[in-house]
């Protein structure tokens, strides 16, 4: 780790469209990138009538939106497809939705994904 920062070397991998994209369906993905740039993990999912459907999980390239985030949390209010990113090995294993609202407190619970 650099100055206490957790370097990301591998992430949980999942692809719901694995057949179409000709990839594995699930596993662990080693993260590659330019040696001086930061690497992250990401997760994307949909909420279909209260049921969580993972779209993809994997490695994500240097992105200031993800810096120093140990947890994978989507903060955007009601996106069509939820996306979060984080730093640290396998940090995308769990992901959450906590929309940033003016006054109200977040009401959502962390999601522990179970790929279908």
């Amino acid at each position: 780790a650099i100055l206490g920062r957790s370097e990301t070397q591998e992430c949980i991998f999942y692809n719901a469209n694995w057949e179409r994209d000709r990839t594995n369906r699930t596993g662990v993905e080693p993260c590659y990138g330019d040696k001086d740039k930061r690497r992250h993990c990401f997760a994307t999912w949909k909420n279909i009538s209260g049921s969580i459907e993972i779209v993809k999980q994997g490695c994500w390239l240097d992105d200031i939106n993800c810096y120093d985030r140990t947890d994978c949390i989507e903060k955007k209010d009601s996106p069509e497809v939820y996306f979060c990113c984080c730093e640290g090995n396998m940090c995308n294993e769990r992901f959450s939705y906590f929309p940033e609202m003016e006054v109200t407190q977040p009401t959502s619970n962390p999601v522990t994904p179970k790929p279908p």
């Epitope: 590659y32 990401f42 993809k56 994997g58 994500w60 390239l61 992105d63 200031i64 497809v81 996306f83």
Partner: antibody, heavy 115, light 111 residues
Amino acid sequence: QVQLVQSGAEVRKPGSSVKVSCKASGYTFTSSYINWVRQAPGQGLEWMGTINPVSGSTSYAQKFQGRVTITADTSTSTAYMELSSLRSEDTAVYYCARGGWFDYWGQGTLVTVSS
Amino acid sequence: QSALTQPRSVSGSPGQSVTISCTGTSSDVGSYNRVNWYQQHPGKAPKLMIYGVSKRESGVPDRFSGSKSGNTASLTISGLQAEDEADYYCGTFAGGRYYGVFGGGTKLTVL
């Protein structure tokens, strides 16, 4: 090695639309943003918008809002930029670039708008 | 989303140093370490030189350096060489909750 290969030059009439493609290779397409930038002849760079290919989420510069649509096809690792209601001032070279830092660029696509 | 402000041109002799400034606001240049610098030779695509204010892109000579003070970022090129003659643009990280914006560009002439 990372490569972004764009579609060829286009000539369009005012009022029509153009769709430029950007095929990525040498890295995982769903691991970073694709940005679109244009440069009119003799002018500077102008940011048009960005897409997160994995979620499909887009952001557009205010100037192009309502006229530009950026999409991505993860099965072919290709991003697209469509600009509608073309006018002569849209004559420019259009570039795609990888990631939030724009660390790799396509070769550019010249779009000429002329009656 | 107003364009960042750069000088239209700068010049220097081989071996000298030049500095190009890029002035914005607290929401772009002054916000976090979002500023990048690009070099563009005529008829070519831009090339990333400096990202995150001061980090040199892989393969870029250490003659190129970046810094920031308040809402103004600077690119310094020391030991000027003929091949450094090009247009230089500052710009900001774009993606997620961040919108992109570029400076108007600075033409560097090596005398």
